[in-house]
Each structure stands twice: as C-alpha cells, then as structure tokens.
C-alpha cells in the first residue's frame, strides 16, 4: 500500500481542516488508514482523524480543530496499521479556503433596484469576519451567454443592483463566494444558489 | 471543589529515592496536563517538570534531567514524581498544579489555576 | 531560557493606594493573536500560591477585580487598583510559553 498522490490540506481557519490525497490502488480508507494530528506546540497531543473515501483510491480527512491563529503549524502523519505511509506538516494559515457565505437573499421589492444580501459565514471573534470580500453570479436560466460577476469589495455582505441592468420577466439565480486577500486564500465554494422573477417597469419613452 | 493533595515527602540521605504523589479530585484528570514545582527555603518558585494529559509527553529542567521521572496513573487521578540520586539542593516544598487543558488539539491554557498544600522534602545525611 | 525579570522587589503600599509590578522577558511571549502566555501568582505567607492572571490579562476565577494585567511580547504589567490589607505576600510573574516554566524573582509587597 503506498500513496499515490501526498495529502494536500485547507482550512476555513475556524474549526476544520480537510486533507485530500490518492493511494496507488483502491482503499477503503476508514477501515485502513488513520491520519494523527499533533499542533507543534508546548504540552499538545495527536489527535486521529478517519478518513472517508473520496472516489476509489481518494481519501478525505476532516480534522478539528478548536480553533486557529497564523502561528499554528502541524505534524501530519499517514498510518495504515503499524505503517507509516507519510510523514507532514500543515500551516492552516497559509492554506485557507473560507467558508461559504449562506442565506442569500434577493430583495426585488425596493423599487427598481435589486437588493442581494448575504451572512458572512465567520463570527465577529474571527479574523477573517472583517477580512471577507465577495464574488457575485447572476445568470439566466434561459439565456447560458447572460452570466455576470459582481466583484464586491467593501465589508458589508451585499449587493445593489438596476433591475434593468437584467432582462425583464424571465427567471435569474446568483450565488455568492468569498475569499481573503490578507491570508491570499482560494475562493470559498459557491453559496446555495437562489432564484427569482425579474420584472421592472421599463420606463415610458419620451417622443 | 478541584482539589490537589500531594504526599510522600520526607527526609532522605543524599543520593537516595523518593516518590512524591498527588491526588487529583472535582476535574477530569486525564485531560489536564499536570506539572510539579518547587520552592528552596527562603527562595522563589522553580519549575521541575510537567506531563501531557494521556502522558504521552513529558518535560524537565535540566537540574533534574535524568534523576527525575514525572508520570501519571489516570485511572487513579494521580501524579507522580520519582526523584533518583537526590542532592542537597533538591531539598524544597514541592507543589503539584492543574495545568493546561490538552483534550483539546489546541491545549487550553487557564494559568496553573490549582495548586496542591505542598509536601516537603529535605535532603540531607 | 527565557529570563524573567521583575520590579520592583520589594514594595510598600499605604491601604487604598494602588501598587504596579513590572515583568519582562528576554523573549516575547506572544505566540500569535491573543496568546501571550504569561501569568501573575501571588504566595502568601505560609501558603501554596494561587493564580491571579493568566495569558497576560485574563483574570482567574474568584479574583478581585481590583487585580487586573496587562502587556505583550516582553513587557508586561500587574495593578492593583486599590491595595489591602490581604494582599500582602510574594507576587510572581511566570511565563510557560516553553519549557522550562521560568519564574520572575518576587515581589514582595508590604503594607507600610
């Protein structure tokens, strides 16, 4: 048993970690394998993640972790049985991936314009709740060419937008992403998207 | 009510043993790390040693380095501190304290926020 | 090591007046955001020491508020608001960022 691909691992600099990786063969990761955890640190002591399968030779990992701060670093060791497979280390903060935002919220009752509010998925105790910027999708789903990015960039979880800068009367969805320039993190995974009925009154021509 | 209660101290002749013990009551004793410190009459607090919560990792300072051994029974909510080939200037009150949290990957750390009363032991021939 | 230093040694305090003790390290005791690990015991005479403040300015369970901490990295600072009579014994500063723990030498507090 060997491993194909070395464990790569984020975190949402909060309380979870995931380490991916492949073996050379098809694993039944639970049953076989164990990743232990130790932070480097004064007293600390390895805690053992589980692994679950992630496609045939994939395995996913899933650590908590109570909470982070950018000193954090940590021992990774790979186990099948009495073997040890890999030997790493992992420093949460230079391997973020935030959160994904959730509850997004299109406003359509104020009056031409499109309000997309959002929760920052971070509580207010956490670095990275005032460290979020957004990315927003809007799409139709009539129209496949008809997909736009909104880059916000401020603090506040939303979004103003002309109703008429869409189409009117047919059906759009947006989600939400987030990432953190401070930490260079990837982009969070998409929120959940959500739908609605685009209509506004187009304004009476002047002849 | 935490509480700590240490014993086994006592006067010894140079060069000889003593197992220091200590109690621990009202916490979840495996999931504390526990550490032993000392005080020299008429001197300050010196730390000696301290050990991990499942007792998988233990430290000393280098004046006991090699004559003393920290462990710990869980299943009795007991420290322990054997000291070997024992010296005049380990004579001293030692105290056991209720250190960090280390169930947690992150050890939680809350000061030595209980101390045992302290048991004396005196090293002289 | 890491060398802890305090001052004053010796410090005579009139009932009600307030009172400051200094603690510095030979290396910075933060080990990120919000974690210095530095405490404040007091002994007092005849007894086992107890624990004032942990990670520079947390105060313990059932302590006064009187007792307050505060500082960062290597210089850091016990006040007393208003002194009494109780407060008498040894003050030590320790820091248990690595081993070895190294305590401050004392400060012995007095009421004048």
């Known amino acids: 048993m060997k491993v194909l691909q070395e464990p790569t691992c984020v975190s949402d600099y909060m309380s979870i970690s995931t380490c991916e990786w492949k073996m050379n063969g098809p694993t039944n990761c639970s049953t076989e394998l164990r990743l232990l955890y130790q932070l480097v640190f004064l007293l600390s002591e390895a805690h053992t993640c589980i692994p679950e399968n992630n496609g045939g030779a994939g395995c996913v990992c899933h650590l908590l972790m109570d909470d982070v701060v950018s000193a954090d670093n940590y021992t990774l060791d790979l186990w099948a049985g009495q073997q040890l497979l890999w030997k790493g280390s992992f420093k949460p903060s230079e391997h973020v991936k935030p959160r994904a935002p959730g509850n997004l919220t299109v406003h359509t009752n104020v009056s031409d314009t499109l309000l997309l509010t959002w929760s920052n998925p971070y509580p207010p105790d956490n670095y990275l709740y005032n460290h979020l910027t957004y990315a927003v999708n809007i799409w139709s789903e009539n129209d496949p060419a008809d997909f736009r990015i909104y880059n916000v960039t401020y603090l506040e979880p939303s979004l103003r937008i002309a109703a008429s800068t869409l189409k009117s009367g047919i059906s759009y969805r947006a989600r939400v992403r987030a990432w953190a320039q401070c930490y260079n993190t990837t982009w969070s995974e998409w929120s959940p998207s959500t739908k609605w009925h685009n209509s506004y009154r187009e304004p009476f021509e002047q002849h | 009510e935490v509480q700590l209660v240490e014993s086994g101290g006592g006067l010894e002749q140079p060069g000889g043993s003593l197992r220091l013990s200590c109690a621990g009551s009202?916490?979840?004793?495996?999931?504390?790390?526990m550490t032993w410190v000392r005080q020299a009459p008429g001197k300050g607090l010196e730390w000696v040693s301290s050990i991990s919560g499942s007792g998988s990792n233990t430290y000393y300072a280098d004046s006991v380095k090699g004559r003393f051994t920290i462990s710990r029974d869980n299943s009795k909510n007991t420290l322990y501190l054997q000291m070997n080939s024992l010296r005049a200037e380990d004579t001293a009150v030692y105290y056991c304290a209720k250190d960090r949290l280390t169930a947690s990957v992150r050890p939680n750390y809350y000061g030595l926020d209980v101390w045992g009363q302290g048991t004396t032991v005196t090293v002289s021939s | 090591d890491i060398v802890m230093t305090q001052s004053p040694l010796s410090l005579p305090v009139t009932p009600g007046e307030p009172a400051s003790i200094s603690c510095r390290s030979s290396?910075?005791?933060?080990?990120?955001?919000?974690?210095?690990?530095l405490d404040w015991y007091l002994q007092k005479s005849g007894q086992s020491p107890q624990l004032l403040i942990y990670?520079?300015?947390n105060r313990a369970s059932g302590v006064p508020d009187r007792f307050s901490g505060s500082g960062s990295g290597t210089d850091f600072t016990l006040k007393i608001s208003r002194v009494e009579a109780e407060d008498v014994g040894f003050y030590y500063c320790?820091?248990?960022?690595?081993?070895?723990?190294?305590f401050g030498q004392g400060t012995k507090l007095e009421i004048k």
């Open positions: 320790m820091q248990s960022l690595t081993t070895p723990y190294t």
């Open positions: 009202g916490f979840t004793f495996r999931d504390y790390a």
């Open positions: 990670l520079a300015s």
């Open positions: 290396q910075s005791l933060l080990y990120s955001e919000g974690y210095n690990y």
